[in-house]
């Protein structure tokens, strides 16, 4: 049974083209070609990583039942955000001995392409989602989740890894983006801002949400993440925006109530298993999808991003707990742990529902209606 949570009608964004090759060759007229906020050093989008071939051939999973109403991201007001002041701070990094992957931080040295060359790739994440430019793709069917309602035992490991809070998931959480596109969930983590400063990674029409959840999945065509990195569809991330609502979200409280125990970087605790699907919006049929990358080093491309149109509501107190409890290395708070939005570079974001309109709110700009390449074909 699902835990109750509040959700409201405000547009969310994020999506992926489900195809192996991003759609389009050139930037579309009104898509951003530079990040909304100043890129932290090392996050510039430069020519880079090639996509490697990959295959997925997996069993079907059962659809999740539909319940509550949904929030519509495409109904959010258009926000002109030529310069988003929320620049990530230089406070979220891991300061352990490690290879390049463990020596990185938000908004400072070393430059991410030095940590991992893929971070300079052309098809990076996150991106700004413009619903009016999304290609409606009827082939994008409701997501199917199976086994996400975990029993209390075995307990799950909740860890402050210095750049996020992460919940490691057991085997058996199956997710299907469509027939033959099957995945298993590996972990979930959050991105957030600071007091009065939103911290989602994806944006919608330049609007940044308070926070964002990512559930990272590995294609069942691959045994390990390392083998899937850079392969089209090798990894898939479900993303949802977190917004402020009037009530406490009981699902999230099961995690947020434990953050004090892992305030220190590198610390971890165990939490009872919970309904992971209750951390996501209830409407699995309305989402944006595009092909991008991991948003932290190694920044590998070929990642299928699915961003729910519906948001998840947390209370103001819960959002404050999220952004004001954890510490990164040294004496710095773990806050503003989001990457700058990256250029689409010709990619077309697909929508599983008609998110766009016939005319763009920007009258001065030409409107380009994008077509869908059926992701399931």
């Amino acid at each position: 049974q699902r835990l109750p949570r509040m959700q409201e009608d405000s547009p969310l964004g994020g999506g992926s083209s489900g195809e192996d090759d991003p759609l389009g060759e050139e930037d579309l007229p009104s898509e951003e070609d530079s990040p909304r906020e100043e890129d932290p050093p090392g996050e510039e989008d430069l020519p880079g990583e090639e996509d490697l071939p990959g295959e997925e051939d997996l069993p079907e999973v059962k659809p999740k039942s539909e319940e509550e109403g949904s929030l519509k991201l495409e109904d959010l007001p258009t926000v002109e955000a030529p310069g988003d002041p929320q620049e990530p701070q230089n406070n979220a990094h891991r300061d352990k001995e490690g290879d390049d992957q463990s020596h990185w931080r938000y908004g400072g040295d070393p430059p991410w392409p030095r940590v991992s060359p893929a971070c300079a790739g052309r098809f990076q994440s996150p991106v700004d989602i413009r619903p009016q430019l999304a290609a409606f793709c009827p082939a994008l069917r409701p997501l199917e989740l199976l086994g996400f309602q975990l029993p209390p035992l075995p307990e799950l490991r909740l860890r402050n890894n210095g750049h996020s809070v992460q919940l490691t998931l057991p085997p058996g959480l199956e997710m299907a983006l469509g027939p033959g596109r099957e995945y298993r969930a590996l972990q979930l983590h959050l991105h957030w801002g600071a007091a009065g400063r939103p911290g989602s990674e994806h944006t919608v029409e330049g609007h940044r949400f308070p926070a964002e959840i990512h559930v990272v999945h590995l294609s069942t065509a691959f045994a390990r993440v390392d083998e899937a990195l850079g392969r089209p569809g090798g990894l898939a991330v479900l993303a949802a925006f977190l917004e402020e609502g009037p009530e406490e979200n009981s699902a999230y409280e099961q995690l947020l109530s434990r953050l004090e125990e892992i305030a220190e970087e590198g610390s971890e605790t165990q939490v009872p298993g919970l309904d992971i699907s209750a951390l996501l919006p209830s409407d699995f049929s309305r989402y944006f999808q595009y092909e991008g990358s991991l948003t932290t080093p190694p920044c590998a491309q070929g990642v299928i991003w699915t961003v729910f149109n519906q948001t998840v509501m947390l209370s103001a107190k819960q959002l404050h707990t999220l952004s004001d409890t954890l510490w990164g290395p040294g004496d710095s708070r773990l806050q503003l742990n989001f990457r700058a939005t990256q250029p689409l570079n010709g990619r077309v974001i697909e929508a599983s529902f008609p998110a766009g309109v016939d005319s763009s709110p920007r009258a001065a700009e030409p409107v380009q209606l994008n077509s869908c390449l059926a992701a399931g074909d």
């Epitope: 891991r94 352990k96 001995e97 490690g98 290879d99 992957q101 463990s102 075995p154 307990e155 799950l156 490991r157 860890r159 890894n161 992460q166 490691t168 998931l169 057991p170 085997p171 058996g172 298993r184 590996l186 972990q187 983590h189 990272v216 590995l218 069942t220 045994a223 390990r224 993440v225 390392d226 083998e227 165990q270 932290t296 190694p298």
Partner: antibody
Framework: QSVKESGGRLVTPGTPLTLTCTVS????????MIWVRQAPGEGLEYIGF?????TTYYASWAKGRFTISRTSTTVDLKLTRPTTEDTATYFC???????????????????WGPGTLVTISS | ELVMTQTPSSVSAAVGGTVTINCQAS??????LAWYQQKPGQPPKLLIY???TLASGVPSRFKGSGSGTEFTLTITGVQCDDAATYYC?????????????FGGGTELEIK
């Protein structure tokens, strides 16, 4: 790419002993490592694991009895207060592929070292 | 706690015959099961990973199958060199208490 254990010897019960796994041809910052033991004539027994970021995990029976640590090229296994039941050949092995702490995936180990024999006897 | 139950504990086969070894996980581990071969005085050698993927250099007469909780190692056309003890390794997850476990082993004798 290889791993090799050393440090195994005869010690009396209660005497701490540290085994060392020396690796070559790969970086411990890219590969997780596991320690396994095998008592004479018995099967393989998982002891513990160290991630690329240096985080350690142990089998529940091994907590408090063993400590895993590492340097840039070695992974140590300390037997804190060994008993006669800890007499065994101790193996270290490398994760099959590169691993990333943030994803927590694991499936198999290869290569393995030849093992080092620890005898606990009074 | 993940427990791997391996059967049989010993098996005998003639050269050219077929051997089947089973491994049962106490909870679902998806396809995260490996098979190892160990000969006396040697470390384990990886044969199969991800339940059914043959490790590099391993003869095709070794075949792994199964998922969830039931797994099988099949050796067809058994050869003298296959005399060894075989172990399954199940992985629920290293960050879970007792999330890594070996089966008890199966000793293969060649008649």
């Amino acid at each position: 790419q290889s791993v090799k254990e050393s440090g195994g010897r005869l010690v009396t019960p209660g005497t701490p002993l540290t085994l060392t796994c020396t690796v070559s041809g790969f970086s411990l910052n890219s590969y997780a490592m596991i320690w396994v033991r095998q008592a004479p004539g018995e099967g393989l027994e998982y002891i513990g694991f160290i991630t690329t970021g240096g985080t350690t995990y142990y089998a529940s029976w091994a907590k408090g009895r063993f400590t895993i640590s590492r340097t840039s090229t070695t992974v140590d296994l300390k037997l804190t207060r060994p008993t006669t039941e800890d007499t065994a050949t101790y193996f270290c092995a490398r994760d099959r592929v590169k691993s990333y702490d943030d994803y927590g995936d694991l499936d198999a180990f290869e290569p393995w070292g030849p093992g080092t024999l620890v005898t606990i006897s009074s | 706690e993940l427990v791997m139950t391996q059967t049989p504990s010993s098996v005998s086969a003639a050269v050219g015959g077929t051997v089947t070894i089973n491994c049962q996980a106490s909870q679902s581990i998806s396809s995260y099961l490996a098979w190892y071969q160990q000969k006396p005085g040697q470390p384990p050698k990886l044969l199969i990973y991800y339940a059914s993927t043959l490790a590099s250099g391993v003869p095709s007469r070794f075949k792994g199958s199964g998922s969830g909780t039931e797994f099988t190692l099949t050796i067809t056309g058994v050869q003298c060199d296959d005399a060894a003890t075989y172990y399954c390794l199940g992985v629920y997850g290293y960050s879970f208490d007792d999330g890594i476990a070996f089966g008890g082993g199966t000793e293969l004798e060649i008649k």
